[in-house]
């Protein structure tokens, strides 16, 4: 969470941004809020990126002005125009690229004053893992797969029954480069699993952490997955 202040004569406005992460190839949002101003035509929003000449996006007089927009953002950005009057200056970003990572500035000017705040935008790839029983194996085993990760994550297994056990010697993890030559598919196989136990496959890099759980009993298989972004907020 970054809060910036600006001074315009005696007036300053608070601008707030949140560090966030973008998933390569998906659409993302760079969050920014400011003190609302009902005079829409008096609001100017400028998004800038450190090291880039030109603007990422500009919104003024109630509409976009992309005349100064840098080429790398062409056709990829939009503000939530109907939410600007209530203080939302967040930026939608289409088809997030690795090169979109960096420090952004959300600059606001209204009839009340002006202000700005920086935002650190991380980019990578992260996806939910899916665990299945691998019936092809000679012994009972579990296969954990996640289609898109970058940078290369670490993979670890855990079990409810054998808490604290190290499964590195009874598991095998591979990383397969996807067709776009950036992200990778993660596959990890855990061998010699026992029935009536809950196993967890944990995949983590510096952007996200994902966990897949599987409980195998005589009568059923229960699965659960979750993903959380790290250092956001």
């Amino acid at each position: 969470l970054i809060i910036g202040f600006g001074i315009s004569g005696k007036h300053f406005i608070t601008v707030t941004t949140f560090t966030s992460a973008g998933n390569i190839g998906e659409d993302g949002t760079l969050s920014c809020t400011f003190e609302p101003d009902i005079k829409l035509n008096g609001i100017v929003i400028q998004w800038l990126k450190e090291g880039i000449k030109g603007l990422v996006h500009e919104f003024k007089e109630g509409k976009d002005d992309l005349s100064q927009q840098h080429e790398m953002f062409r056709g990829r950005t939009a503000v939530f125009a109907d939410q600007v009057v209530v203080g939302n200056a967040s930026l939608r970003l289409k088809n997030v690229q690795l090169t979109d990572a960096g420090t952004y500035t959300c600059y606001i000017r209204t009839s009340k004053g002006k202000g700005n705040a920086n935002l650190e935008y991380k980019t990578g790839a992260f996806s939910m893992p899916e665990i299945n029983v691998d019936y092809n194996a000679s012994s009972e085993s579990l296969r954990c797969e996640a289609p898109r990760w970058f940078p290369q994550p670490t993979v670890a297994w855990a079990s409810q029954v054998d808490q604290g056990a190290n499964f590195s010697e009874v598991s095998n993890t591979s990383f397969e480069l996807n067709s776009e030559n950036v992200t990778m598919k993660v596959v990890s196989v855990l061998y010699n699993v026992t029935i009536n136990n809950t196993y967890s496959c944990m995949i983590e890099n510096d952007i996200a952490k994902a966990t897949g759980d599987i409980k195998v009993t005589d009568s059923e298989v229960k699965r659960r997955s979750q993903l959380q972004l790290l250092n956001s907020g």
Epitope: E26, D64, L66, G75, E180
Partner: antibody, heavy 120, light 107 residues
């Protein structure tokens, strides 16, 4: 409501330059949230995006046509234009102009289209 | 470039029936997809953008769904004016590309 109208010669000789103009009425070409694009459709075939322009003059072209395409804008006349050089019979198509959202980038509305035939 | 593939090429449907058109992208386009309707001798008309948002003035019988690489346009109850060619278009990355079209004809 916004309307677009293509104009230009319907017949162009091989190796010459195809020139079309799109006139925008019912709204300003300087509207900030839009690009202005060209799309073509050979007879009985599908649609191909040619490129777009912003009112400030910045352009983006389809790489398959980039070496032959020029799109320009005249804000005083509320018009934008397409030039396609060194044409061949394969460039025979109905050429459409359209307003293109800055993002989302859908095309709406479209001009009614003009058929350009490349033949000697 | 991203290749868009539509199926079937031709769909024969009786008036009042449901029509389901498919569009597949060669790689993920997230929800950055639009659908257009084109009648003979006319320009295409925008129906859907953002994969599922109906354009202004488009009847509720038209609906879009899907994300990533698989998309569907559904016409819940075909009217006589709906017989036309339908195109999908991705705007996820340049160059923007269209599918080859699906012709919906009267059965």
């Amino acid at each position: 409501q916004l309307q677009l109208q293509e104009s230009g010669p319907g017949l162009v000789k091989p190796s010459e330059t195809l020139s079309l103009t799109c006139t925008v009425s019912g709204g300003s070409i300087k509207s900030g949230s839009y690009y202005w694009g060209w799309i073509r459709q050979p007879p009985g075939k599908g649609l191909e995006w040619i490129g777009n322009i912003y009112y400030s003059g910045s352009t983006y072209y389809n790489p398959s046509l980039r070496s032959r395409v020029t799109i320009s804008v005249d804000t005083s006349k509320n018009q934008f234009s397409l030039k396609l050089s060194s044409v061949t019979a394969a460039d025979t198509a109905v050429y459409y102009c359209a307003r293109e959202g800055s993002y989302p980038n859908q095309f709406d509305p479209w001009g009614q289209g003009t058929l350009v035939t490349v033949s000697s | 470039e991203i290749v868009m593939t539509q199926s079937p090429a031709t769909l024969s449907v009786s008036p009042g029936e449901r029509a389901t058109l498919s569009c597949r992208a060669s790689q993920s386009v997230s929800s950055n997809l639009a659908w257009y309707q084109q009648k003979p001798g006319q320009a295409p008309r925008l129906l859907i953008y953002g994969a599922s948002t109906r354009a202004t003035g488009i009847p509720a019988r038209f609906s879009g769904s899907g994300s990533g690489t698989e998309f569907t346009l559904t016409i819940s109850s075909l009217q006589s004016e709906d017989f036309a060619v339908y195109y999908c278009q991705q705007y996820h990355s340049f160059p923007f590309t269209f599918g080859g079209g699906t012709k919906v004809e009267i059965k």
